[in-house]
């Protein structure tokens, strides 16, 4: 069938979920890209003790999530609902800060060193997190 | 040994339709993301389009956004590109190509031998 | 989008010469940059990957280096069938990785 019981070789397993740690920076459309390209998502944080998980493997390193108002409201990328949901950002934000001069404001959302969230230019190339449901991906795992 | 293996190319008027295959041998297909990517007669190498493992996500150049689809059939380890309203300029050989993750870093390491296809009237 | 420019178009160069390539990308790219090499006629084949990284089965007289928007591409000791075009390529722009327009290395 097309469900797995682990997760792929480098993921980790946690609560029905796998997530990717990168080691590297990207423009946060282009971390959305390739997690897409990995059947998965930038991670979508629903809960304290998933942010708690995020944020131990991730450290004190500036890390995209899957959340943007580039379009208006702010919306995380697999369709769970902002409003309701939960949130973890710093004191102030997000701000929309349009002082950094790059052009426009922030409109990505992003850990910071602390865990907490702030939104900031989405070009910015920051590490990222890809994640995916194990009801969601492939049986076989890859070759690498 | 693993292997890509491109077919359908040919000779196409303008305006016309063509559909390519990529069958795959001796690796997890399902596991992998595909590519199609294109060389025009003694041009350089440009990437055409990609689509995830499962088939879920699909991205395309802007030059044949609209005109080409890429699709996979994980039953049979093949790659299809459905390439319609054909023009002069896509005129090239045609490759598959294996998309390699290590570490966030992404590149095309395993490739096919390529079908041409030729758009002329 | 990123552009990928390559220098020289073209060299000749003996067996046995240490060869360079440099490769350049319009904006910071970190160390998404791969290296092909294409023979006439045939696909192209991944040499490097991640500016550095040799693929399996290359032989260990290529080398890569750089970081940002300046790359190089080293054969050490250019053998016979080395003589093919080299493609450097970004991987920063994910699915967009866009070509360099390649450098012909002839035989001298």
């Known amino acids: 069938g097309s469900e797995r019981t682990c997760c792929p070789v480098n993921w980790v397993e946690h609560e029905r979920s796998c997530y990717w740690f990168s080691r590297s920076g990207k423009a946060w459309a282009d971390a959305d890209n390739y997690c897409r390209l990995e059947d998965a998502h930038l991670v979508v944080v629903t809960s304290w003790e998933e942010q708690k998980f995020v944020q131990h493997h991730i450290g004190p390193v500036n890390t995209w999530m899957g959340l943007h108002d580039q379009n208006g409201p702010w919306k995380w990328v697999d369709g769970t609902d902002y409003e309701t949901g939960f949130k973890n950002w710093r004191p102030e934000q997000p701000d929309d800060w349009y002082g950094h001069g790059l052009g426009g404001g922030e409109d990505c959302a992003h850990f910071t060193d602390d865990g907490r969230w702030n939104d900031d230019v989405c070009q910015r190339p920051y590490r990222w997190v890809c994640e995916t449901e194990l009801d969601k991906a492939s049986q076989e795992p890859p070759l690498l | 040994e693993v292997q890509l293996l491109e077919s359908g190319g040919g000779l196409v008027q303008p305006g016309g339709s063509l559909r390519l295959s990529c069958a795959a041998s001796?690796?997890?297909?399902?596991?992998?993301?595909m590519n199609w990517v294109r060389q025009a007669p003694g041009k350089g190498l440009e990437w055409v389009s990609v689509i995830s493992g499962r088939g879920i996500n699909t991205f395309y150049a802007d030059s044949v956004k609209g005109r080409f689809t890429i699709s996979r059939d994980n039953s049979k380890n093949t790659l299809y590109l459905q390439m319609n309203s054909l023009r002069a300029e896509d005129t090239a050989v045609y490759y598959c190509a294996s998309r390699l993750a290590v570490a966030g870093s992404e590149a095309f390491d395993i490739w096919g031998q390529g079908t041409m296809v030729t758009v002329s009237s | 989008d990123i552009q990928m420019t390559q220098s020289p178009s073209s060299l000749s160069a003996s067996v046995g010469d240490r060869v360079t390539i440099t490769c350049r990308a319009s904006q910071s790219i970190n160390n998404y940059l791969n290296w092909y090499q294409q023979k006439p006629g045939k696909a192209p084949k991944l040499l490097i990957y991640?500016?550095?990284s040799l693929q399996n089965g290359v032989p260990s007289r290529f080398s890569g280096s750089g970081s940002g928007t300046d790359f190089t591409l080293t054969i050490s000791s250019l053998q016979p069938e080395d003589f093919a075009t080299y493609y450097c390529q970004q991987s920063y722009s994910t699915p967009l990785f866009t070509f360099g327009p390649g450098t012909k290395v002839d035989i001298n």
């Open positions: 991640a500016t550095s």
């Open positions: 001796e690796f997890t297909f399902s596991s992998y993301a």
